[in-house]
Interface confidence: low
């Protein structure tokens, strides 16, 4: 059994999260993640879903009675996740902590718009779709 | 062209975002961008930074200046993101959308906490991959 | 040459009010935007909230919403803040500061702290 099992389980406790009537109208990420078959599909609501874990368990973390068991179900995330790769993990963490009202990164973020729109189509990278763009440039 | 370019050089007027000086102290999103080349690698970061420009153009959804700006982006970003799927696009925005200091998402979180672990591991519903993990467990 | 002057900041107890003023002068355009931004001890600046002056168009961050209210009268040229149930997290430093089409500028703030 994997590590985070018993943790998760002494956070259920803890949240008050075994009952039944938790799982009243409907659930936040199953159902979801049900939804998405295809990795990148997938890649997109994890990241959401993790970034949402991490806030959360942020909340929580001058709190000693979970601390335990946190920071074994971050390490689990780490490695399922991220792959055990820290720099994957150091930049996600990165993007989670841009603040949107703090005016410079305001800047940066319109400033970087239109090479960051240039790829977000999953084939943007590829040589086939930059010659296949260029007959259509004029 | 792409529609977006022309809107995103309006954005970074409103902004005062195209002067050199914007660029200084490295990039945002940029820079995470070229580490990572793997699809799902990307799609976990590119996640992280559609969320942050859905949120970045939410604070200002009632500047009438820039209102179409911000729609003809959105909408691009649909395109080429979502792949005008309304239904990832709806998913995903429900995930941005929950609010972590909320009791009843607190305590739902936790419950499905041990189910979204399982899943994260990006094989981790195929066959094969049980097996061969089954190998190593002794 | 755009001037901007800030005024009414001060100390003030959790949950009470300020309101602050903002004088401006030097407009040559009719197309600009007027905010509020606040830069809290170590921190960066943070935009709180801004008000367009050709469309009337009025936003808010998130984290003064329903507390802060945002006022431009064009007659006096002069933006206000009016800050309600002021909580310690919103001291700082306030400026107010215009984007007049594509340049920004900013006053010399005013020193808000909210404290028991």
């Known amino acids: 059994q994997d590590p985070y099992v018993k943790e998760a389980e002494n956070l259920k406790k803890y949240f008050n999260a075994g009952h039944s009537d938790v799982a009243d109208n409907g659930t936040l990420f199953l159902g979801i993640l049900k939804n998405w078959k295809e990795e990148s599909d997938r890649k997109i609501m994890q990241s959401q879903i993790v970034s949402f874990y991490f806030k959360l368990f942020k909340n929580f973390k001058d709190d000693q009675s979970i601390q335990k068991s946190v920071e074994t179900i971050k390490e689990d995330m780490n490695v399922k996740f991220f792959n055990s790769n820290k720099k994957k993990r150091d930049d996600f963490e990165k993007l989670t902590n841009y603040s949107v009202t703090d005016l410079n990164v305001q800047r940066k973020a319109i400033h970087e718009l239109i090479q960051v729109m240039a790829e977000l189509s999953p084939a943007a990278k590829t040589g086939k779709r930059k010659r296949s763009q260029m007959l259509f440039r004029g | 062209q792409d529609p977006y370019v022309k809107e995103a050089e309006n954005l970074k007027k409103y902004f005062n975002a195209g002067h050199s000086d914007v660029a200084d102290n490295g990039t945002l999103f940029l820079g995470i961008l070229k580490n990572w080349k793997e699809e799902s690698d990307r799609k976990i970061m590119q996640s992280q930074i559609v969320s942050f420009y859905f949120k970045l153009f939410k604070n200002f959804k009632d500047d009438q200046s820039i209102q179409k700006s911000v729609e003809t982006i959105k909408e691009d970003m649909n395109v080429k993101f979502f792949n005008s799927n309304k239904k990832k696009r709806d998913d995903f925005e429900k995930l941005t959308n929950y609010s972590v200091t909320d009791l009843n998402v607190q305590r739902k979180a936790i419950h499905e906490l041990i189910q979204v672990m399982a899943e994260l591991s990006p094989a981790a519903k195929t066959g094969k991959r049980k097996r061969s993990q089954m190998l190593f467990r002794g | 040459q755009v001037q901007l002057q800030e005024s009414g900041g001060g100390l003030v107890q959790p949950g009470g009010s300020l309101r602050l003023s903002c004088a401006a002068s030097?407009?040559?355009?009719?197309?600009?935007?007027m905010s509020w931004v606040r830069q809290a001890p170590g921190k960066g600046l943070e935009w709180v909230s801004s008000?367009?002056?050709?469309?009337?168009?009025?936003t808010y961050a998130d984290s003064v919403k329903g507390r802060f209210t945002i006022t431009l009268d064009n007659a006096k040229n002069t933006l206000y803040l009016q800050m309600n149930s002021l909580k310690p997290e919103d001291t700082a430093v306030y400026y107010c500061?215009?984007?007049?089409?594509?340049?920004?500028?900013r006053g010399q703030g005013t020193q808000v702290t909210v404290s028991s």
């Open positions: 008000i367009n002056s050709r469309t009337g168009s009025i």
């Open positions: 500061a215009s984007r007049v089409d594509d340049r920004v500028s």
């Open positions: 030097g407009f040559t355009s009719s197309n600009y935007a």
